[in-house]
Amino acid sequence: PPRGRILGGREAEAHARPYMASVQLNGAHLCGGVLVAEQWVLSAAHCLEDAADGKVQVLLGAHSLSQPEPSKRLYDVLRAVPHPDSQPDTIDHDLLLLQLSEKATLGPAVRPLPWQRVDRDVAPGTLCDVAGWGIVNHAGRRPDSLQHVLLPVLDRATCNRRTHHDGAITERLMCAESNRRDSCKGDSGGPLVCGGVLEGVVTSGSRVCGNRKKPGIYTRVASYAAWIDSVLA
């Protein structure tokens, strides 16, 4: 099943997030992703855990997954580079870089997103945008069009409370509020954008969605700047 879900959000403005990618397995949406360079999409490492024998592709320029759109194009993946320290049983280092088979054709609906290089926490309360094609309610309804939700960043101390994530949120992770408005598994790999800059990537660990005591967890891209640069070089 697709690893994805935006809860409590709304349909995004079509093509207003030209960096948004759908990572697909055998032609079906699997995870979110974000175009960070002409030939590279950043996503979550866990997304490809079950994809060993399948065909992984990246859809760019899409709003609707099913409808024809002039800007839509499906790219094959030349190389998949998970973070070397990512492991199946932890949320740490949950990043994946996908090299497209060719440079993406850029335009108004396809454009890389600047990503944060300054390794400093986003201030609690900052409003950030997360988008994806995951299911939109607990009944499992999957949207055809891109959904998004605006979420306030939650401070790490609160997120690490015993009642919340009990110390699991390292300095390389960040949290956002999850009270009925939330991202979830299949938005995994999708972007958390604050102030027009990529700050986080939705982690793909399993957690309850939409529960305020289980905030959304995002990998802080600034903490992995050296690794991202080394792969893209």
Partner: antibody, heavy 119, light 107 residues
Framework: QVQLKESGPGLVAPSQSLSITCTVS????????VDWIRQSPGKGLEWLGV???????NYNSALKSRLSISKDNSKSQVFLKMNSLQTDDTAMYYC?????????????WGTGTTVTVSS | DIQMTQTTSSLSASLGDRVTISCRAS??????LNWYQQKPDGTVKLLIY???RLHSGVPSRFSGSGSGTDYSLTISNLEPEDIATYYC?????????FGSGTKLEIK
Amino acid sequence: QVQLKESGPGLVAPSQSLSITCTVSGFSLTSYGVDWIRQSPGKGLEWLGVIWGVGSTNYNSALKSRLSISKDNSKSQVFLKMNSLQTDDTAMYYCARSYDGSYWYFDVWGTGTTVTVSS
Amino acid sequence: DIQMTQTTSSLSASLGDRVTISCRASQVISNYLNWYQQKPDGTVKLLIYYTSRLHSGVPSRFSGSGSGTDYSLTISNLEPEDIATYYCQQYSKLPYTFGSGTKLEIK
């Protein structure tokens, strides 16, 4: 036509609680947020909090301990409750529809209801 | 909290004038700024969202600009119905905060 209308008690005694209702028409409370904003005499605007379409809330941290926002979708009503009122809570209280698409703004405001805290 | 400063509390101008009202944020707000108009009877209306986008139904004489921490609202051809107080508001971070307002009067 989108409209919001506040109704409140007008006068509240110090240390008592305030309850205001915002009745909306022309849109569904399940699809939009509703915010509460107040304006003290001669002062600017202060955001109090919001209740989203899904029922979750965010509050101004300065007032969080004595503020509660709830709603009844079927009656198209949003409720503000504030405890332990003091004279500096005297203000015009507005509800406003919150649009949280690609951009975030209060696109339609109520006309406001005056609340005076006095013994 | 992010402080929004409107240094000019009142401004007097003649009909037909071009008027600019400024607003400064205490930190970078990445264009996440709206402008509202409050008429003397208390009615509040959205004018501009996301720094420069005109809300539907708002006359084109209103425009907004700015970046980083400094923003402005311009009325290009002042009309009698523009007599009001104008507020900026940031939505970069909770709690949302407003400027203290600039009251526009006719000379």
